[in-house]
């Protein structure tokens, strides 16, 4: 007879159970969000259930499907784009992913008005960008680097653009630097209010040094990839914006946008592009030391059909204690009298914040003010501004929706979302429909993610889009980790920090630490949002504590604590991560022994570099896919905050913060190095160069590689890698398995 | 009032090189892309080669590609044909055109290019 | 590239007559960069009919530009006596941009 202890059947903490790992790479407990496809004030399309394109429209409650699920499922079609006239869609199929927002695809066009599929002059594959005119049904597409434009989606195409290579020069989408750090889109082609004018962006990249790796695939030979990706200190892309008149292209051809003359005499960037109207444009450029910026307003001149850059329409926005802006230099939201805009930068106190530009910048007339940050506008109507910020309660983590009337003086401020759902919706994010008639909040948490639909005049809700009610269902059985956001204060620095404790946390027993670091410059790791994610199951079913700390560098908290890293990235994040896990230690729950950290990217370098500074605070580690010296990443991103890798700039620093020179420091901590060997972004030489030195030094250590995989780690490899990185985790802590 | 003068024509052998001009007034020359067309004595009308308002691209038909070259230089107003290695068929009036592709509005009076030994 | 044959070669016609000149490409152009000259004898080619149909500036509206696709037609309502001439119709959706071989309009 066996013994069993029997079950308390009336405690409900025993019917339920912890997350599990699988429960975890399943994506069991993940959330739906819901953005209205908007396509006039109060209309918006939206993908069903069962695939049905369905048009919704808020003021008479209809809702009629434009698109069947059999005419997407006749050509494999994931996605979809109706033209503004509503006469035709483009159906995507074939996708086939390249970089992080690139990608190629094969496109049809379907005739509302008739049924069927448009034949006569088809579309090419695969095409790399396509999208329709804001007006009418004009299309504009990249085809092998090269623009063309169909008047009609049955004409023949117009190629505006000849000089498109491969991997040398780029027409109307981005090369791998420009979309990685700079646009952060797959497209560098923008057509003007009415469909007018189409402005492109070439990118040659004929002098950039090329990295080349080895993709092994399955044939008898690996294959190898190139790509062109200016390293820090290299040869960058030149750039040069054209603009051509659509209505009649072939007569004036591609006009050339004028670079502004003091960005033009050294290196430099363009960074995005804004039209006002079909006859002003808005460019903005940045030095290639990036802490001055320009914006531009140009004018077409009909009578010379040129287009005019006047230096009095040139705004210079210039950082004394960084770099330009935050993580991109923020782009302008214009007003309706076309000239005047509203931008984010920093006030006197160093604090980013709304400004209204009438003339020059130099006049600027703040909006918003306070020891918090102004983080995104998102419409500008007649007499509303909406945007987010993270002031409410002081939470620099959070993000609330505020309207400030620009119609009325003074303006008034009111915050829409701070007392909607105020225990379960702290992070929002909106959409607007036109003139901002309608809008869509989506809250991500802290609790279950919601989305609702609002009137734009009242505020109102109208109705709920998605409230993950079967997410709600699913959690009520699981042992789900307590969190907390708190603040830790040392020597004048505010170190906010997110810790995450198992279900049955009691403050008398020791557990075992994991740091989860990010730390990149600009980023926010501390932030009211839901997850179910690994580090949850951690704690939920190991026992763990996980704490994630935003240190110096990071963004939303000032410039004070964002510049700090400036020129010297590596030393105040490692500094910060170490003096919050001293703080966690006193806190008293802490095992010391049994402390680790890990990070990917950028919070693999910190991580590696945490653990090899000698503290002896860290058992163990894992850095998965880590810089290991800045000058093996991309130019755009560590130049804005390392400056250049030369003798009489700041080479000194590039050589002492890699993780190569603190190979010796490795010795006494357990460390699992992880990299993809197809990473285009983080390159696997990085890794490869930390194997080496740690060789070189004759220190053990553990290493994983995922063959032909980008700096993602997607597909089975994820299963993998979190199965693996658990087992390091569990014999580093001594957890039976 | 839109002017295009060319010149620089003339009789040339074969194999020889000859420099054709085309100064430009009445319009911002800068912003337009320009053309040059040909017509052979008693033929058709050939175009040539095109170039962007700021020079930045430049586009020849294959029948020329690799012995002209066709550039202008925006602060002389001048639009300019680099002729190279050239050959009987090569011999027509040249006419500059305003224009890139089509819809060339205004053109040259030209000037004769006769490729003889 | 595109051809574009011009019919009929030549077009004898009297002044105060209405004239069709056709012109037929070998694929799909559309009006939006179709284009019909004027020349005559020693002088350099004139634009009529710019891209999209529309008329040339200063360009009298007894001539008009119509068609689509491949088919291309230019009409001139009441042939005046300038109006004797080698007329070219011209494409520019596609490289090369190519001109017609020209219909001759001559004097009955």
């Known amino acids: 007879i066996v013994l069993r202890p029997s079950r308390v059947h009336n405690s409900e903490e025993n019917t339920m159970r912890a997350l599990t790992l699988k429960d975890i790479l399943n994506g069991t407990f993940s959330y739906k969000t819901f953005f209205p496809n908007w396509i006039s004030g109060q209309e918006y399309l939206h993908q069903s259930a069962d695939n049905n394109i369905v048009l919704y429209n808020i003021e008479t409650g209809q809702s009629y499907t434009i698109l069947s699920n059999r005419t997407m499922k006749s050509v494999n079609a994931s996605n979809y784009g109706l033209s503004p006239d509503r006469q035709f869609v483009y159906l995507e199929s074939d996708y086939s992913k390249l970089w992080r927002y690139s990608y190629t695809a094969t496109y049809y066009i379907y005739d509302l008005s008739n049924g069927e599929f448009v034949r006569g002059n088809e579309l090419p594959r695969p095409i790399q960008y396509l999208c329709w005119s804001p007006v009418g049904s004009k299309l504009a597409y990249v085809y092998q680097n090269n623009i063309y434009l169909k008047q009609r989606p049955g004409d023949p195409p117009f190629q505006i653009t000849f000089n498109g290579r491969e991997n040398k020069i780029f027409n109307g989408i981005p090369d791998w630097v420009y979309e990685e750090e700079m646009l952060a889109t797959k497209y560098a082609l923008w057509w003007s209010p009415n469909g007018k004018f189409l402005a492109y962006a070439e990118f040659n990249d004929t002098d950039i040094p090329v990295i080349a790796y080895s993709y092994y695939g399955d044939e008898q030979y690996p294959r190898t990839i190139n790509i062109p990706y200016p390293k820090a200190g290299a040869k960058n892309p030149v750039v040069r914006i054209f603009i051509i008149d659509t209505t009649y292209p072939a007569y004036v051809g591609p006009q050339e946008v004028p670079v502004p003359a003091m960005i033009a005499s050294s290196d430099y960037y363009f960074s995005w592009l804004t039209w006002v109207t079909d006859e002003r444009v808005c460019l903005q450029w940045l030095k290639r030391v990036q802490n001055v910026s320009v914006l531009s307003i140009c004018d077409f001149r009909e009578d010379w059909q040129t287009w005019d850059c006047p230096k009095t329409q040139e705004h210079i926005e210039e950082s004394r204690t960084g770099w330009a802006g935050g993580f991109f230099v923020s782009t302008p939201v214009f007003s309706y009298d076309a000239i005047s805009y509203y931008k984010i930068f920093s006030d006197k106190d160093g604090y980013k914040h709304i400004h209204y530009i009438k003339d020059t910048v130099e006049n600027a007339i703040q909006i918003t003010s306070g020891k918090w940050e102004a983080i995104n506008i998102f419409r500008v109507t007649q007499d509303s501004l909406f945007y987010s910020s993270n002031e409410f309660e002081e939470y620099p983590g959070r993000r609330n929706i505020y309207r400030i009337s620009i119609g009325s003086y003074p303006p008034s401020k009111k915050c829409v979302t701070c007392h909607l759902r105020k225990e379960r919706c702290q992070y929002y994010t909106a959409s607007f429909s036109d003139y901002a008639k309608y809008y869509a909040l989506v809250c991500y948490g802290p609790g279950i993610p919601i989305s609702t639909l609002h009137d734009g005049r009242t505020d109102q809700e109208i109705k709920i889009l998605e409230e993950n009610k079967e997410l709600e269902n699913a959690l009520k059985n699981i042992q789900l980790p307590k969190e907390e956001i708190k603040k830790l204060e040392v020597d004048e620095i505010t170190l906010w920090y997110k810790m995450i404790l198992p279900p049955q946390f009691d403050r008398s027993k020791k557990y075992p630490l994991l740091i989860q670091v990010y730390g990149g410059p600009c980023s926010q790791s501390v932030r009211s949002v839901f997850a179910v994610n690994w580090i949850s199951y951690l704690a939920s079913k190991e026992g763990m504590v996980i704490a994630l700390v935003d240190g110096r560098g990071t963004a939303f908290q000032g410039d004070k604590l964002l510049y700090a890293v400036y020129r010297k990235l590596g030393v105040y994040e490692v500094e910060d991560q170490i003096t919050a896990v001293r703080k966690f230690i006193e806190m008293g729950f802490i095992d010391e022994k049994r402390i680790a950290i890990w990070g990917w990217s950028y919070g693999g370098y910190v991580s590696s570099l945490a653990l090899a500074s000698g503290t002896g605070l860290f058992k163990c580690g894992i850095a998965v896919a880590p810089v290991s010296s800045w000058e093996y990443y991309a130019s755009v991103y560590t130049e804005r905050f390392m400056g250049l890798p030369t003798k009489d700039d700041n080479l000194e620093h590039y050589k002492n913060s890699t993780v190569m020179a603190r190979a010796e420091y490795f010795r006494n901590v357990d460390y699992l190095l992880i990299h993809g060997t197809a990473d285009d972004n983080v390159h696997f030489q990085n890794s490869a160069q930390i194997a080496k030195a740690l060789v070189n030094a004759q220190v053990d250590f553990q290493a994983m590689w995922y063959s032909d995989q980008n700096h993602g780690l997607s597909g089975l490899s994820t299963n993998h890698l979190y199965t693996h990185m658990t087992h390091f985790l569990k014999q580093c802590f001594s957890l039976s398995d | 009032e839109v002017q295009l003068l060319e010149s620089g024509g003339g009789l040339v052998q074969p194999g020889g090189s000859l420099r054709l001009s085309c100064a430009a007034s009445?319009?911002?020359?800068?912003?337009?892309?320009m053309s040059w067309v040909r017509q052979a004595p008693g033929k058709g009308l050939e175009w040539v080669s095109a170039i962007i308002g700021s020079g930045a691209s430049t586009y020849y038909a294959d029948s020329v590609k690799g012995r002209f070259t066709i550039s202008r230089d925006n602060s002389k107003n001048t639009l300019y044909l680099q002729m190279n290695s050239l050959r009987a068929e090569d011999t027509a009036v040249y006419y500059c055109?305003?224009?890139?592709?089509?819809?060339?509005?205004?053109w040259g009076q030209g000037t004769l290019v006769t490729v003889s030994s | 590239e595109i051809v574009l044959t011009q019919s009929p070669g030549t077009l004898s016609l009297s002044p105060g007559e209405r004239a069709t000149l056709s012109c037929r490409a070998s694929q799909s152009v559309t009006s939006s960069y179709l284009a019909w000259y004027q020349q005559k004898p020693g002088q350099a080619p004139r634009l009529l009919i710019n891209?999209?149909?529309r008329r040339a500036t200063g360009i009298p509206d007894r001539f008009s530009g119509s068609g689509s696709g491949t088919d291309f037609t230019l009409t001139i309502s009441r042939l005046e006596p300038e109006d004797f001439a080698v007329y070219y119709c011209q494409q520019g959706i596609m490289l090369p941009p190519t001109f017609g071989q020209g219909t001759k309009v001559e004097i009955k």
């Open positions: 055109a305003k224009g890139w592709f089509g819809g060339f509005n205004y």
């Open positions: 009445g319009f911002t020359f800068s912003s337009y892309a």
């Open positions: 891209v999209g149909s």
